[in-house]
């Protein structure tokens, strides 16, 4: 903590400007009014303060707002956000998507820090659900965001938000997460026609039950092997050879290369050899 000293004559800062970069830490503490700093936070980000100087400015804001910063200050924190601890952020009430974007921008290109995770958690809890605009914003900054949520947290995602999800946002999701997301996606895309529906639902199919896979097999979807390999084993096992052939279309030949991997291996073992032979791929049950 910076020791309290009187501000030297003529050093009192009338505004937050670039000359403050030359102020020693004790001078910043003594000569910069905290209320002035709060009202001119938008200027701080344009001034190349050292990290130690930023510590002093943070300390001044902490003293001014012991219960947590108001959103008018939070929105303009800029690089000062990197100085905040998760404990600081838990005191905030962030409701504006613009504020969230401004702070995520500061951390852009870096891994999701504990500060960012806390900020997102506070924001989403404040909104009550992961609405489409929020999800759009979060996945734009952190493509893996959705898959970092627990199935319980994902259950608060409304089906309308699923439109914001891109295939790459689901790359790291496990089956438990897809089990939660798939029914929401099915609901969200239900009014689309066959081929368009399949394009949208494809990346969620790791959560699809057997009956939905059977229905898809009747629609000439030509599922690729990469998608097939991500299907739930328990959903694939009851499918007949004919259904898998229809589901994969021309991609059925790819089963041979995957015959030793799940779910293909387990599915092959469940089929009659006569049925497998109809594929002409040399699969051995």
């Amino acid at each position: 903590e910076v020791e309290k000293t009187a501000c030297p004559s003529g050093k009192k800062a009338p505004e937050i400007d670039e000359s403050l970069i030359f102020y020693k830490k004790w001078e910043l503490e003594a000569c910069v009014d905290a209320a002035l700093l709060a009202t001119q936070m938008d200027r701080v980000n344009a001034i190349p303060f050292t990290y130690e100087q930023l510590d002093v400015l943070k300390h001044k804001l902490d003293e001014l707002y012991p219960q947590g910063y108001p959103e008018s200050v939070i929105q303009h924190l800029g690089y000062l956000f990197l100085k905040m601890s998760p404990e600081d952020i838990r005191k905030w009430n962030v409701t504006s998507l613009e504020t969230l974007k401004a702070l995520l921008e500061v951390n852009k290109g870096h891994e999701m820090s504990p500060q960012v995770a806390t900020l997102i958690d506070r924001f989403v809890k404040g909104r009550g659900q992961l609405d489409k605009d929020t999800l759009d914003t979060l996945t734009a900054f952190y493509p893996g965001y959705l898959c970092s949520l627990s199935p319980e947290e994902l259950s608060s995602v409304p089906p309308s938000s699923i439109w914001a999800v891109r295939p790459q946002d689901l790359d790291t999701c496990d089956p438990r997460q897809l089990d939660v997301l798939y029914p929401k996606a099915r609901l969200a895309f239900q009014n689309m026609n066959g081929s368009e529906y399949f394009v949208k639902i494809q990346s969620f199919l790791g959560g699809a039950p057997t009956e939905d896979l059977k229905a898809l097999s009747q629609q000439n979807v030509s599922m690729d092997l990469a998608t097939f390999m991500k299907l739930r084993t328990d959903a694939v096992l009851p499918l007949t050879v004919a259904e898998v052939q229809k589901l994969l279309g021309p991609h059925v030949e790819g089963l041979k290369a995957e015959e030793r991997h799940r779910p293909v291996r387990d599915w092959i073992l469940r089929q009659r050899q006569d049925d497998l032979d109809t594929l002409g791929l040399g699969l051995q049950g």
């Epitope: 670039e18 030359f22 102020y23």
Partner: nanobody
């Protein structure tokens, strides 16, 4: 790479004036800060005056009202006009330029923040 060269030092009587010049080359845009530091024998290097890329100025308490820092953009030169010189102003004066993108150091009054330094020019004030 920025090159910084000071000139204008010398021996003067107390109460007289001197103007130091600091010519920088090797870049087209202004550094974040240009500053004049001084170091008296047996003492630490201390900030005398600073100038930001936007033209804002800063002076240490000991020279405020007597020294003026300015620059001529066309000549890529920063000046330190020193009036009413005192015996205690005797020191080697260094010009420094800094960009410090990673923002380390305690503040821009700390010499550790500056990457580029001149070789120094001696100012001696006799009483």
């Amino acid at each position: 790479e920025v090159q910084v060269v000071e000139s204008g030092g010398g021996l003067v009587q107390a109460g007289a004036s001197l103007r130091l010049s600091c010519a920088s080359s090797g870049r087209t845009i202004s550094p974040i800060a240009m500053a004049w530091f001084r170091q008296a024998p047996g003492k630490e290097r201390e900030l005398v005056a600073g100038l930001t890329w936007t033209g804002r100025t800063y002076y240490s308490d000991s020279v405020k009202g007597r020294f003026t820092i300015s620059r001529d953009n066309a000549k890529n030169t920063v000046y330190l006009q020193m009036d009413s010189l005192k015996f205690e102003d005797t020191a080697v004066y260094f010009c420094a330029a800094g960009d410090n993108p990673d923002r380390r150091g305690s503040s821009w009054s700390s010499s550790s923040v500056y990457e580029y330094w001149g070789q120094g020019t001696q100012v001696t004030v006799s009483s």
